[in-house]
């Protein structure tokens, strides 16, 4: 996160760290807890690393440097990448992770509410992006979970800034015209959440941007509301019954 500040314990209890253990262990992506056994993240996090057993998912943590060999983590039972995601395109950047064992909810580890299907009418004015990603383009992974308040921008405005790419209705953009605040490398897959009527909702999944926090280059996020049918279909067909956090 560029231009962010340290988060507090329990402030973003749905935020998880997706880490890979090969020879060493490192944080690669963020994700959002959406049910006892489900994490929502970006499909591109798994490019070149589709093997379930190399991944470790840490929930209920604030500081990555607190992780030791004894810190509990979740393992992956199943990775469900959107069927229309292609490595050569930037569309449908969404994936579900089914955990091997369900997680208990605590003050520091609980799910984020999902938006309503095709939610286009809600005007979100209080949106935040969180993650342990770089604090500048040529930076490094941060120890303490960072947060930053970023306004949504219209898809029309976003398309003007990215003439070279297709900004679809299944994407949502956020950023300041002058730059300075944005997600960055390592924040992929993490949440863009907005508070509406006193409730936090998962509006976007951190997907891509041109550099980080550059002027007139907003961040682009997968629009979760556009994938609600897919999320419900996959979680229900796998579970029998879904235990998702839908909006009240």
């Amino acid at each position: 996160i560029v231009g962010g500040t340290n988060s507090s314990w329990g402030e973003w209890p749905w935020q998880v760290s997706l880490q890979v253990k090969l020879t060493a262990q490192r944080h690669l992506c963020g994700g959002s807890l959406i049910g006892h056994q489900w994490v929502l993240t970006a499909a591109h996090c798994f490019d070149g690393l589709p093997l379930q057993d190399v991944w470790r998912i840490y929930s209920g943590i604030l500081n990555l440097s607190d992780i030791t060999k004894d810190t509990p983590f979740s393992q992956i039972k199943e990775i469900i990448i959107h069927q229309n995601y292609k490595v050569s395109e930037g569309n449908h950047d969404i994936a579900l992770i089914k955990l091997q064992a369900p997680l208990n909810y605590t003050e520091f580890q609980k799910p984020i509410c999902l938006p309503s299907k095709g939610d286009t009418s809600t005007i979100y004015t209080n949106c935040w992006v969180t993650g342990w990603g770089f604090s500048k383009e040529k930076g490094e992974i941060q120890n303490i979970l960072q947060k930053v308040n970023i306004p949504l921008v219209t898809n029309e405005e976003c398309q003007k800034r990215y003439q070279d790419y297709k900004i679809t209705q299944r994407m949502v953009c956020a950023g300041y015209k002058e730059g300075g605040k944005d997600a960055c490398k390592g924040d992929s897959g993490g949440p863009l959440v907005c508070k509406h009527n006193g409730m936090w909702r998962l509006v976007g999944i951190t997907s891509w941007g041109e550099g980080c926090a550059r002027r007139e280059q907003p961040g682009v996020y997968t629009k979760v509301a556009e994938y609600m049918d897919w999320i419900l279909e996959k979680t229900q067909s796998s579970d029998g019954k879904a235990q998702m956090q839908s909006p009240a």
Partner: antibody
């Protein structure tokens, strides 16, 4: 299976014009940036031009700017290169290629993942 | 323009040997926009490596790419007969997109 098939090459006199076409199949053409790359006989690869998925955004090498025009017809899955005021130094095999633009580490990637077999353009009197 | 300089110009090696090809850029290039291609005589180029280090679909694991910033390397761990040809690095970080002049790998 992704396929790109160029056509329209041939022998043309200096100052003349030629229009190259590239028929695409096996993928959603309208989702991809497309481009032309050329290779003079016995020489290396030189990027010529590209066009965004909608056709609203283009780029050209300085050596062809003002003389060549790239365009596309997404309804026909076809890419074009209109070449005017041709010079001897434009003699080359012209390849059309798909520009893959995925995502890695929260940034876009860009690389040329599929190429046609090329069409030879010879500019000579 | 970003200049791409490849070295050596020609590499003469026997099958089974290791090939190390270098590509230097005149300006910083984001690794996501650095690719390597192989071309054999009479054929179109073929994508080998994208994002500086990711192997394209169907490319054997004897091919690997590394590098960051202005220095990139393509390594072929054990040369096979079909690996002989010309290799190009290429950047699409900034237009004009540019290629290196190529490194020819020939049979010793």
């Amino acid at each position: 299976e992704v396929q790109l098939l160029e056509s329209g090459g041939g022998l043309v006199q200096p100052g003349g014009s030629l229009r190259l076409s590239c028929a695409a199949s096996g993928f959603t053409f309208s989702n991809y940036t497309m481009q032309w790359v050329r290779q003079a006989p016995g020489k290396g690869l030189q990027w010529v031009s590209y066009i965004s998925p909608s056709g609203g955004y283009t780029g050209y090498a300085d050596s062809v700017k003002g003389r060549f025009t790239i365009s596309r017809d997404n309804s026909k899955n076809t890419l074009y290169l209109q070449m005017n005021s041709l010079r001897a130094e434009d003699t080359a095999v012209y390849y059309c290629a798909r520009v893959a633009r995925g995502i890695a580490a929260r940034s876009r990637t860009s690389y040329f993942d599929y190429w046609g077999q090329g069409t030879l353009v010879t500019v000579s009197s | 323009d970003i200049q791409m300089t490849q070295s050596p110009g020609t590499l003469s090696l026997s099958p089974g040997e290791r090939a190390t090809l270098s590509c230097r850029t005149s300006q910083f290039v984001n690794s996501n926009y650095l690719a390597w291609y192989q071309q054999t005589p009479g054929q179109a180029p073929r994508l080998l490596i994208y994002g500086a280090s990711s192997r394209a679909t169907g490319i054997p694991d004897r091919f690997s790419g590394t590098g960051y910033g202005t220095d990139f390397t393509l390594t072929i761990s054990r040369l096979e007969p079909e690996d002989y040809g010309t290799y190009y690095c290429q950047q699409s970080s900034r237009t004009p997109w540019t290629f290196g002049q190529g490194t020819r790998v020939e049979i010793k």
